[in-house]
Interface confidence: medium
């Protein structure tokens, strides 16, 4: 999946995850992902997105919440919650990649 086009210059985002090389990153958009694996506490990661924009369409479930935004450091103060409203198979963008 190519980088999302027509967004103009890259955006700077807060980066807080094991994959971060520093406190910020640059990408086509910013992300906050809250994931709860079975038997573990939810883990929240902040970073940059370049691929699979369709994931941004997914609404919260009891296991994952994937939020995207497009402005400078827009993911810095976003605090996500998990909401048991959909099963994972109902998330958008899963028919083809």
């Amino acid at each position: 999946d190519p980088v999302k086009p027509s967004r103009g210059p890259l955006v700077t985002c807060t980066c807080e995850s094991p994959h971060c090389r520093g406190p910020t990153c640059q990408g086509a958009w910013c992300t906050v992902v809250l994931v709860r694996e079975e038997g573990r506490h939810p883990q929240e990661h902040r970073g940059c997105g370049n691929l699979h924009r369709e994931l941004c369409r997914g609404r919260p479930t009891e296991f994952v919440n994937h939020y995207c935004c497009d402005s400078h450091l827009c993911n810095r103060n976003v605090s996500l919650v998990l909401e048991a409203t959909q099963t994972p198979s109902e998330q958008p963008g899963t028919d083809s990649q």
């Epitope: 999946d1 190519p2 999302k4 086009p5 027509s6 967004r7 699979h52 924009r53 369709e54 941004c56 369409r57 609404r59 919260p60 919440n65 939020y67 976003v78 605090s79 996500l80 919650v81 909401e83 409203t85 959909q86 109902e90 998330q91 958008p92 963008g93 028919d95 083809s96 990649q97």
Partner: antibody
Framework: QVQLQESGPGLVKPSQTLSLTCTVS??????????WSWIRQHPGKGLEWIGY???????YYNPSLKSRVTISIDTSKNQFSLKLSSVTAADTAVYYC????????????WGQGTLVTVSS | DIVMTQSPDSLAVSLGERATINCKSS????????????LAWYQQKPGQPPKLLIY???TRESGVPDRFSGSGSGTDFTLTISSLQAEDVAVYYC?????????FGQGTKVEIK
Amino acid sequence: QVQLQESGPGLVKPSQTLSLTCTVSGGSISSGDYYWSWIRQHPGKGLEWIGYIYYSGSTYYNPSLKSRVTISIDTSKNQFSLKLSSVTAADTAVYYCARERDYGGGFDYWGQGTLVTVSS
Amino acid sequence: DIVMTQSPDSLAVSLGERATINCKSSQSVLYSSINKIYLAWYQQKPGQPPKLLIYWASTRESGVPDRFSGSGSGTDFTLTISSLQAEDVAVYYCHQYYSTPWTFGQGTKVEIK
């Protein structure tokens, strides 16, 4: 001004495949800012969303139609298409193509719609 | 699927009077993390495609007259036409874009009394 225009046969025989194309003008279908949908409206009835496609080719289909639906995109022609297989009289409807903003916000541009009748 | 139920199915209102259309979703369409309601309203006149009026439950689309307003909470929503005009005669639909598949209400027909 963005415009969408549906085209395709107005009459399809039962068990055959309905094929429609939506041509987008006044804007690029390759923009990552939008998703492109097909929606239908049975005569005198409400609206039923069929599915969407993103510029990358990723799709999502209404589960009620998923086994019969294919949506594809041709960015070089600024078009996206709908194929609905094994049609019956129940598929007789006005078919609309529409544009949806990336972050949601509803369908802001629609085609005029094309009536497809399924009959032998 | 989220079921959208509108009421009434039709209503007749005198010119210049207020028209109120209700829409109820079978589950919440509020994305609480970002406090946004994933609900839109459309107007459809005979022989025309639907026209977007309101999105995010209460934001008017550009060019839509300010006599149209939307309000509501997680599951109960209202479209209000503050002073009905002759050109407002149409069918109005609510639409949720929170959970796929996107779904619409059955429509409310607004006529002049």
